[in-house]
């Protein structure tokens, strides 16, 4: 059917609670595309009726709630004007009660369920809640060993639990809980987190690191469409802004009228001690005026650029 297959990581999920997965694969989903979800190579799309327990909500697949029998491979098909990509997501559902004495026995827990606090420092834990905006999430409550966390050392800040002056006693099993409301119905979301303590300093210091680009030129033909990713590693939930600029101006502002060159939607992948961010720049049509200009990716205090250049003439063509 002409679709390019992309295989994503496995997701291991807890039964009896809501779950959502967003079909985004930049740069594919940054333009005008249609997204359709399927289960186990079925030809019938997942329902878009919001009353259905499993339904598609814009680019998301939403389970209200997830059930044990929902395990399987789900595909989202992203169709653009000239492209088709099929993304495979393997969902494994397990029965887990977070108040069990041990969090052991879970296969390959993702990094969202394993977090680290740094001894003697002020640090934080993150409650990962990924749902479409049709879901309203109530205030987050935090628990340790099944008791609600209280005390001066702890502050709930958005999806974070701030912990001041981390001690060895702060290791253990945590859970964050929120009530999700969708179409008038309420569901409990409960994420378990196993927390370990380390004396090592955190990941890579506090300056964001631009992995790509690396201050280099790119050969590109006149008139073609070009998409370039800026990949940045930074501390978890940092406050640095990532953007593309030209002539010290945001590209979206610089090309405000023509919209010929645009910044894409930022996405990120969460690792244990850092996030990898991606924000792309799209040249809908490369023009002569683009050559030789440094297009700068900014991430906090870090910068890196690309310069477009015309390919050297290919004399074999003559």
């Amino acid at each position: 059917d002409g679709c390019k297959d992309i295989f994503m990581k496995n997701e291991i999920l807890s039964a009896s609670q809501p779950f959502a997965f967003n079909c985004t694969f930049p740069p594919i989903t940054s333009g005008e595309v249609s997204v359709t979800w399927y289960k186990n190579s079925s030809k019938i799309p997942v329902s878009k009726i919001i009353q259905s327990r499993i339904h598609q909500d814009e680019t998301w697949i939403l389970f209200l709630p997830m059930e044990w029998g929902d395990s399987g491979v789900y595909q989202c098909v992203i169709k653009g004007r000239d492209s088709c990509h099929r993304i495979h997501v393997n969902l494994t559902v397990f029965e887990k009660h977070w108040c069990d004495t041990s969090i052991g026995g879970l296969p390959n827990l993702s990094d969202e369920y394993k977090q680290i606090l740094h001894l003697g420092k002020d640090d934080s834990l993150t409650c990962h809640l990924h749902f479409p905006k049709s879901c309203v999430l109530g205030p987050i409550k935090w628990y340790k060993d099944c008791n609600e966390i209280k005390g001066e050392r702890f502050t709930v800040l958005e999806t974070r639990l701030l912990v001041s002056n981390v001690s060895a006693e702060d290791r253990g099993n945590y859970a964050c809980q929120a009530i999700l409301t969708h179409s008038g119905k309420q569901y409990e979301v409960l994420n378990g987190i196993t927390v370990s303590i380390t004396e090592r300093a955190g990941y890579g210091g506090s300056v964001p690191k631009i992995i790509y680009p690396k201050n280099h030129s790119i050969e590109v033909q006149l008139g073609t469409t070009l998409i370039v990713d800026c990949n940045v590693t930074d501390t978890k939930d940092n406050t640095n802004l990532r953007c593309w600029r030209v002539n010290n101006t945001l590209v979206d502002d610089y090309y405000d009228e023509s919209k010929r060159i645009r910044e894409g939607v930022e996405t990120h992948v969460s690792f244990r001690e850092h996030n990898l961010y991606t924000v792309n720049i799209t040249f809908l049509e490369v023009k002569m005026e683009d050559y030789g200009l440094p297009f700068m990716c900014h991430a906090g205090v870090s910068t890196a650029y690309i310069i477009l250049q015309l390919p050297a003439p290919d004399f074999r063509a003559y």
Epitope: K121, D122, D123, S124, K133, C135, V136, L137, E152, R153, T155, L157, E158, T159, R160, L162, S164, S206, V207, T235, D237, N238, T239, N240, L241, V265, G300, V301
Partner: antibody, heavy 117, light 107 residues
């Protein structure tokens, strides 16, 4: 919860520099997040002035950039605002606040600064 | 700068009424929309962040929605303690900007 305490003179003469300090309790300003100044003229809306981040980098509102400096004293867990060449239009309640990944989550109680000769 | 246009600028309603406030951004803000409540002489308090997430201690009668450029905030059953000015704020693009505020009064 986090606690903030703004301090500084309540009266500043026109053309002088307004100086305020925010003391933060229960979390280190070098641990994470952005530490902000926001102001509100009497009977009016809110205006973001700028921030200093956990790593020490700053960002200011372009409308005030030429007059604003935000610094920090990590040993005292404080960050400070300086606004130069003030006029009566700078009369406002000045708040300090932490910005999480999305919002100004916690605020100080604010301090009124009047610019008058 | 992104302009945040809030409406209405003021409203008067009875206890138990449903109250809706809207906020429109002049540009796309990718759901980075927050709502605050401010009572006279006090600092603003965060109610809702990232369009649809309620902050600690916020009662469920406060209900948000929206996406793209248009966002709404509803109090399902107005209580006397809800008398305040409400502000929206975008956190997507620097400089971060606030709406002009909506003053909510009891009839």
């Amino acid at each position: 919860d986090l606690q903030f305490q703004e301090s500084g003179p309540g009266l500043v003469k026109p053309s002088q520099t307004l100086s305020l300090t925010c003391t933060v309790s229960r979390y280190s300003i070098t641990a994470d997040f952005a530490w902000n100044w926001i102001r509100q003229p009497p009977g009016k809306g809110l205006e973001w002035i700028g921030y200093i981040s956990y790593s020490g980098d700053t960002n200011y509102n372009p409308s005030l950039k030429s007059r604003v400096t935000i610094t920090r004293d990590t040993s005292k867990n404080q960050f400070s605002l300086k606004l130069s060449s003030v006029t009566a239009a700078d009369t406002a309640v000045y708040f300090c606040a932490i910005r999480g990944p999305y919002s100004f989550t916690y605020w100080g109680q604010g301090t009124l600064v009047t610019v008058s000769s | 700068d992104i302009q945040m246009t809030q409406s209405p600028s003021s409203l008067s309603a009875s206890v138990g009424d449903r109250v809706t406030i809207t906020c429109r951004a002049s540009q796309w803000i990718n759901n980075y929309l927050n709502w605050y409540q401010q009572k006279p002489g006090k600092a603003p308090k965060l109610l809702i962040y990232y369009t649809s997430m309620l902050h600690s201690g916020v009662p469920s009668r406060f209900s948000p929605s929206g996406s793209g450029n248009d966002y709404t905030f509803t109090i399902s059953s107005l209580q006397p303690e809800d008398i305040a000015t409400y502000y929206c704020q975008q956190g997507h693009t620097l400089p971060w900007t606030f709406g002009g505020g909506t003053k909510v009064e009891i009839k």
